[in-house]
C-alpha cells in the first residue's frame, strides 16, 4: 500500500495505490484511490509510467483525454468513469504484456489540491492448480496441474499428517512450454500417497502463490484451491464442495472484467 501526498502549493490531497500483478493475456487493474471531489469536471487523473514519454491515460473534465497517450497504451486503457466521482482513479489495462511491468504514477488534481502515488506493477502468468488422483498410475499417485505460469515457479508438496516432510524424493515436476512460447504448464506428480490424508501442491513464483489441496478418504475426495498475489491484497479461493471467491481491486479482472 502506497499513500502519497501532494507537495506543490498550499493544498495537498491523499492518493493511495496498491502494488499489484497482471496476468499476461488478460485484463489488469492498476489500483488508485483519492479524496473525492463533489464536481467531476474539477477532477484530473493522469497515469504515467517510468521510462515512457507519453501518458498512459488521462481523464479530465469528465471524459478521457488521450491526445498525449503513448502509442503502446492506445486502445488498451480506461478508467471507471462512473466511479471517479467517489474517488476511484483505478485504471483498466487490456491484454497485459510482460513489457507492461514497471513503476506507474497515479497523479490527481482536484479543487482541493494535488497528489500522487507510485505503484509497482509486476507481470507474469499464474493460474489455479488442480490436484487429482492419477488412476492410470501403478501406485497411489496424485497429479497437480496448473495451465499457465511465468516466470518458472517452484513446486513443493506437503501433507497434513507428515508435517515438515520432504517430498522431493517421491515427486516429479515438469514444465511444458505452452503454444505461445511464453507461459508454461506445470505438472507435478506425487507418488506413494496414503489414504485419509490431506496433500497440498504449492506453486510459487515472485508474482503469485497458489495451493491445491486434496483430501482422499475411503468415501470421498475433497479439493480446494487458493491463489494469492504476492505484495498485493488479493486472493481467490475455490473448493469442490463450497465455492467462495472474493477480490480486492488487483484481482478484479480475473473475476469480472471484459
Amino acid at each position: 500500500l502506497i499513500i502519497g501526498f501532494g507537495i506543490s502549493g498550499r493544498h495537498s490531497i491523499t492518493v493511495t495505490t496498491v502494488a499489484s500483478a497482471g496476468n499476461i493475456g488478460e485484463d489488469g487493474i492498476l489500483s488508485c484511490t483519492f479524496e473525492p471531489d463533489i464536481k467531476l469536471s474539477d477532477i484530473v487523473i493522469q497515469w504515467l509510467k517510468e521510462g515512457v514519454i507519453g501518458l498512459v491515460h488521462e481523464f479530465k473534465e469528465g471524459k478521457d483525454e488521450l491526445s498525449e497517450q503513448d502509442e503502446m497504451f492506445r486502445g488498451r486503457t480506461a478508467v471507471f468513469a462512473d466511479q471517479v466521482i467517489v474517488g476511484n482513479a483505478s485504471l483498466r489495462l487490456k491484454n497485459v504484456q510482460l513489457t507492461d511491468a514497471g513503476t506507474y504514477k497515479c497523479y490527481i488534481i482536484t479543487s482541493k489540491g494535488k497528489g500522487n502515488a507510485n505503484l509497482e506493477y509486476k507481470t507474469g502468468a499464474f493460474s489455479m492448480p488442480e490436484v487429482n488422483v492419477d488412476y492410470n498410475a501403478s501406485s497411489e499417485t496424485l497429479r497437480c496441474e496448473a495451465p499457465r505460469w511465468f516466470p518458472q515457479p517452484t513446486v513443493v508438496w506437503a501433507s497434513q499428517v507428515d508435517q515438515g516432510a520432504n517430498f522431493s524424493e517421491v515427486s516429479n515436476t515438469s514444465f511444458e512450454l505452452n503454444s505461445e512460447n511464453v507461459t508454461m504448464k506445470v505438472v507435478s506428480v506425487l507418488y506413494n500417497v496414503t489414504i485419509n490424508n490431506t496433500y497440498s501442491c504449492m506453486i510459487e513464483n515472485d508474482i503469485a502463490k497458489a495451493t491445491g489441496d486434496i483430501k482422499v478418504t475411503e468415501s470421498e475426495i475433497k479439493r480446494r484451491s487458493h491463489l494469492q498475489l504476492l505484495n498485493s491484497k488479493a486472493s481467490l479461493c475455490v473448493s469442490s464442495f463450497l465455492a467462495i471467491s472474493w477480490a480486492l481491486l488487483p484481482l478484479a479482472p480475473y473475476l469480472m472484467l471484459k
Epitope: D27, D64, E65, L66, Q69, G75, A78, N95, T183, K258
Partner: antibody, heavy 121, light 107 residues
Amino acid sequence: EVQLVQSGAEVKKPGASVKVSCKASGYTFTSYWIGWVRQAPGQGLEWIGDIYPGGGYTNYNEKFKGRVTITRDTSTSTAYLELSSLRSEDTAVYYCARLDGSSYRGAMDSWGQGTLVTVSS
Amino acid sequence: DIQMTQSPSSLSASVGDRVTITCKASQGFNKYVAWYQQKPGKAPKLLIYYTSTLQPGVPSRFSGSGSGRDYTLTISSLQPEDFATYYCLQYGNLLYAFGQGTKVEIK
C-alpha cells in the same frame, strides 16, 4: 439506447470511391471506438478497421491499407468509411459497430443496420 | 496477423441438441474472444465476450470457454430461434479477426 444509423445503399463503378456514414446516438460519441466490418454476399464477416473519435486514432486491416480511410466528425457524431479503387469483390454489406469498453478497445456490442455497396460496370 | 480458424463450417442439428463450435487462433494467447450470432439480412449480435462472459439479455444456454489458442461456443439445448450463423472474433490485438463462420441448420 445506443443507435448507429448508416447511410443508404450505393452502386459504384470499378475504380470509383465510396463513402459510407454512420451516425451515432444514445452515448458519448467521442468516448468509444467505432469499427467497420464488411460481409460479401454469402460470405463471412471481415474486419476493416476502427477509429477512436476522441482523438481520431485509427487501426486498419493490412488487406485494405492504402485503399481505406476511416474518419469522424465529432460535431455530428458521425463516423465515415471511405474505400477507393473499388473492384467487383468489394461488393458487400458494410457495417459500423461500436466497440465496448470506452477508450479500451473491446468487442463490438452495438451495430448499424448495414449499407449495401454494389460495384458493377 | 492472427487468423481464427473456425470449425465446423456448417452443422445440422435438432431442437434440444447440444451444439459445440470451436475457434483456434493461429498464434498468441489471450482471453479476448467474442462470439456473435447472425441471421439472414440482419446485423450480427454479440453473445459472449472475454471468452466466457454472457452479454446481458442472452439466454444462459449459450456459454463460452477456452484458453491459449482454443476457444469454444456451446449451446446446451438448441432452440428453434438458434438456427443461424455463428462467428468468433479475436479482439485482443491491434488487428481484429473473425473466424469464417459456422452455419447451424435444422436436421
